[in-house]
Each structure stands twice: as C-alpha cells, then as structure tokens.
C-alpha cells in the first residue's frame, strides 16, 4: 500500500484499530503488532497497469514482485482474498516479464502447510524470469465506448459503454451516481451520504439501466451498508468518498460490469484523456437527465487547478481536477459520486468520483473529483473488514 494519510512519521505505519504507530520492520513479519492484526493482513498489493503482485518485505522495508517459480492459482486466490476480494470474484493470473526487477519474493515450497507469506522469502534471482500478475476481478472492460457526448449539453451514452455506472435513488429520485467495483461494492461520494442519507435503507441502486423512467424499486438493489470516509470534511469536500455495500450481489453481464480500482505505480499525466458519466443536469440549475450521458474531459494539473484564477488553493492531494479551462464540458448536479475513468492498456480505471465544482461547465471552473488513487488502501480495508 501507499501508506497515505498516516499520522505516523515517514518511518512508521499506523494501526487502523488503535492509531498507534509501528516500525516498518514489524509490518508483515508474521507477528501481529497491531491490536486488530492489520499489520499482518495488508502485506500484498497489485502494482501498475499490469496488476503485478507485490509483497511487502519486513526485512527490506519495501515492496517486491513475486517470482512466478512454483506459483499456482491457489496462492493467487489467497492474495486476492487478503486484499479484500471474495474467492468467487477471482478472475485470472498471468505472468509478466520481470522487466528488470532485481529483487523478488519467492516461494519456499518445502515450508509446509503455512500461511502464504510465511512461504515467501527474499531472493535476488527468479529462474522463470517472470513475475506474477493477478486479476482479482474481471474489471474495466466495456462494450464499445460511447460516441462523443457531454453531461452538460450533450448526447446519450450507448448501452454497455459505462457498465460500472449506477444510479443511486432516494425517495424514487436519482440523487447521485456511483461506480461498481465488485458485485457487492459501489464507490460514491461522501457528500451524497451526509445525514440523513447515511441510513442504508434510504438508498436503492440501479445498474445496467440507462433511462431513469425504467428504474422502479423492484428492479433496484437495496443497500446494506453505507461507509463514509472517516476524514471527510463537508465544508472543504476533502476526502469526498464513500462506499455502499449492496444487500445482494449484482449479476454481471454486458451492461453491468465493474471498473478497476487504480493500482499504486500508475502515473497520471496532465491532460490525460478521461471520461465522466452520469444522469446529472445537462445545464446549470437544470433537471436530472432522463438518459445517461458521458463526456470526454482532460486531467488538469493540481498546481494549475490551485492557481489564483482557478480554485486558489482549494484543491487538496485527495482531489483531482478534470475538464477544460475554457468550460463547456463538465459534470453537474446529480453527477456527484459518479465515475471519472481513464483507459490504459485497454482497461478502464476509476481515478475519480465526482465531487464538486463552482457552477457547471464555467470557464476556469473545472470539475473536481475525489482522487481514488489516494483512497484505494481505505477501500480495500473496508472490503477486507467486511469479510
């Protein structure tokens, strides 16, 4: 993990359960030092756009790829489980050229029937010259992308173009968007679930339906749990992310599929092409759209977005700006919580959740999105804690 937002100094890592700091050499060393034992269950991550499996080495105090030698599907499933994915989500494992790695974690097959991490040891060689790549869930795949369209003043999305997009209803009204990340979990914005809408029974999620008029209670999925980021600030909209767990899992098909959560090591470029989607208003102060709309936007550097003529230092590291400084294309009221996605390696990645902006599609007032990259650790922790 990128141990971000920790209260500990650079050299320490925070226990979720107690807030105490522990030495990185005690992290993933086979002995629980945190009261909740989480120092021993956050030892695995997927890195970069190729989903390279990395394991934390307490001796080296750093992350290392896992050598393919003697690796099998069961270990892959165990690693995915440790990240918070359920067994039945498991998609596939692959191998990737070790791409110049000089340091690996290798399996000691003679270690007997012990925990996967106790079987791993540090090695400077990998005879297969390949490292493990893991897909814990088949995510980020859509039918052909939507034609060029806009949320403010544009066209509708094509069926299956944004299969992770959900409409979240309260009182039979579309209130926010959300993104499917597993059959049970939806990412949305924390500002969507501020009191009194923090109660799960207020919410119904609709997936795979493009038109609002086709959404009726019986066709929706009730929400079991609403988890808002503990550091969400309603004034500044900092840490504006929340999770919803559905009462029963979605059935995936061409129109309902998950988006991929970004992996550490994925570098976002300024002006990177992204897409936003939602049923939000198609003009400022307008009504919710009947049909799902989508629009192309560009990422805007935080430094630029924080400039005096744009948002004047209101953008935190937990936020991303996207849109066009000249305006015209933007998310709007009702798009909140919905996805900001980008395509890399033919996979769609959730890099933002629609958060806030000054008006809609105004010049020098681009859309602001929760920076999902900063929250992946928190998301996996919630999924893992839910078991």
């Amino acid at each position: 993990w990128k141990f971000m937002g920790s209260k500990c100094s650079n050299s320490g890592i925070e226990c979720d359960s107690s807030g105490t700091c522990i030495n990185p050499s005690n992290w993933c060393d086979g002995v629980s030092h945190c009261p909740g034992g989480e120092d021993e269950n956050r030892c695995v991550r997927l890195y970069g756009p190729n989903f390279i499996l990395q394991v934390y080495s307490s001796q080296r105090k750093s992350w290392h790829p896992v050598c393919q030698d003697d690796w099998n599907e069961n270990y892959g499933r165990a690693a995915c489980r440790d990240m918070g994915y359920k067994n039945n989500f498991y998609s596939s494992q692959g191998i990737v050229d070790d791409s110049g790695s000089t340091s690996f974690m290798k399996l000691n097959t003679s270690a007997g029937n012990v925990d996967i991490y106790k079987k791993l040891y540090h090695s400077d060689a990998c005879s297969s010259k390949a490292v493990v790549s893991l897909r814990c869930i088949a995510c980020g795949v859509n039918l052909n992308s939507s034609r060029q369209s806009r949320i403010v003043g544009g066209e509708s999305a094509l069926p299956g173009a944004w299969p992770w997009q959900v409409s979240l209803h309260v009182q039979n009204v579309h209130v926010c968007g959300g993104s499917i990340i597993t059959p049970e979990w939806i990412v949305t914005a924390a500002h969507c679930v501020e009191k009194p809408l923090n109660n799960p029974w207020h919410w119904t999620a609709f997936a795979g339906i493009l038109r609002q008029s086709f959404m009726f209670y019986g066709a929706g999925y009730q929400v079991e749990k609403v988890i808002s980021h503990p550091n969400y600030d309603s004034k500044t909209k900092n840490n504006d992310i929340a999770l919803m767990k559905l009462q029963k899992p979605l059935t995936f098909n061409d129109l309902v599929k998950p988006v991929c959560l970004p992996n550490p090591g994925m570098m976002l470029q300024p002006e990177q092409l992204c897409w936003i989607s939602g049923w939000g208003a198609t003009e400022e102060k307008g009504k919710t759209s009947e049909v799902l709309n989508a629009a192309k936007v560009l990422l805007i550097e935080t430094q630029r977005c924080n400039s005096r003529y744009v948002y004047d230092n209101l953008i935190t590291p937990a936020m991303i700006c996207a849109g066009f400084l000249q305006g015209n294309v933007d998310s709007c009221q009702g798009d909140s919580g919905g996805p900001l996605v980008t395509s890399k390696n033919n996979i769609w990645w959730l890099i933002g959740d629609t958060s806030w902006g000054s008006g809609c599609a105004k010049a020098y007032r681009p859309g602001v999105y929760g920076n999902v990259m900063v929250f992946t650790d928190w998301i996996y922790r919630q999924m893992r804690a839910d078991g």
Partner: antibody
Framework: QVQLQQPGAELVKPGASVKLSCKAS????????MHWVRQRPGQGLEWIGI????????NYNEKFKSKASLTVDKSSSTAYMQLSSLTSEDSAVYYC??????????WGQGTTLTVSS | DIVMSQSPSSLAVSAGEKVTMSCKSS????????????LAWYQQKPGQSPKLLIY???TRESGVPDRFTGSGSGTDFTLTISSVQAEDLAVYYC????????FGGGTKLEIK
Amino acid sequence: QVQLQQPGAELVKPGASVKLSCKASGYSFTTYWMHWVRQRPGQGLEWIGIIHPNSGTTNYNEKFKSKASLTVDKSSSTAYMQLSSLTSEDSAVYYCARLLWDYFDYWGQGTTLTVSS
Amino acid sequence: DIVMSQSPSSLAVSAGEKVTMSCKSSQSLLNSRTRKNFLAWYQQKPGQSPKLLIYWASTRESGVPDRFTGSGSGTDFTLTISSVQAEDLAVYYCKQSYNLYTFGGGTKLEIK
C-alpha cells in the same frame, strides 16, 4: 397480491420468550426491508426495528435493543421477532410492515401478545 | 431523537364536514436532495392494522380517496379530509423517516 400473515394471538408467561412470525407472499421477499411496530392497548405506534431479508442486516430502536431480536428465514419468506424476558409491559399488538422507499406500504394484521401468569 | 407532535388528540365532526389535523416535527423533515419530506400519514380503523394514506407529505397512495390531502413541508404538516365520511372514523398517525422512524401520538377522528 402482497400479503403479510401474522398469527392472531400468543399467550406467554412472564420471564419467558416468544418468537412472533410474519409470513410474506405476493412479492420478492428478499428485495424489501421489513419493519416491526408495537402498539400497546389504547396507545399509539412505536417503531421497534428493521431487517433486510437478504443479508439479515438489522437496526433497532434503542429502546428495544435488549428486548427484540429480528431474524428471517428466506426459504419460507418469513420474518421473525423474538422478544425475551417478557413482562406484562410487553403485552401489545405487534405488526410487521414492508418498507417501500421510506414508507410502510403493507402491514400485517398484527399479533396480540398477552403476557400473563 | 425527532419528536412528532399531533394535534388535536381527538375531534368529532359531522359527515360532510372538512377536517384538518396537524403534525409538527422537532426538526425539519425536508430532504434537500430530493426536495421531498420524509413524512407519511397512516389511518388506523378500530380493530384493524394501520393503512398508508399519504407519503412524502403530499403524495396520495393509490386507492386512497381524493378527499384525503397531505400538505406542508419542513416541520409543519397537515392532513385534510375535504368531506368526512362515516367510514373515516379512525386514528390518524403521522410518521417521520428522516432519522430512523417515529410516529406521532395520533389524532382520533369521531363522527357525530
């Protein structure tokens, strides 16, 4: 049509427990939250708690947390409420009701619970 | 906790008369996101279970006669029966679902 069937009456002794049932029919039981409501003789309505039949997720009125326990049996489309350590104060009519959005659109006929030695 | 207060606690009217009853909440029940109120009205006839009349403060449940009208927003709500019929003899309860669920004490309607 939607129906919530509850037994008409239950007679139990003080200190005992009772499990009240609410059998749902005419709709997808696992899609809708189910509520329980109490009405003491000649009194108003009091909300006890809520359960989702698919996951078993519950939430209770603080007042009833140590008194009531909500469960479901998906196979028979039945919701249950167990009431423990019964006293005469628990004598009341207990209703189950289905939640649609945020209102109770269908109610059971109610079970009259009498706690008496 | 949100407290729901209903008034009057009882009233007696003749058939054909117009009736209004009030329900006040200790805090606003308006959902700013949907612009709907988390308030419903229920009718309970003697010996029967409650029946939904009005939800979201002013939306009439299907099958409910149009003489029943709900109005109000925020903290003050009213149920109006434009021309009372003998079968309207019942206790009427308001209920909030803004924060968990609370019923008002009820208004008993009697027919003279």
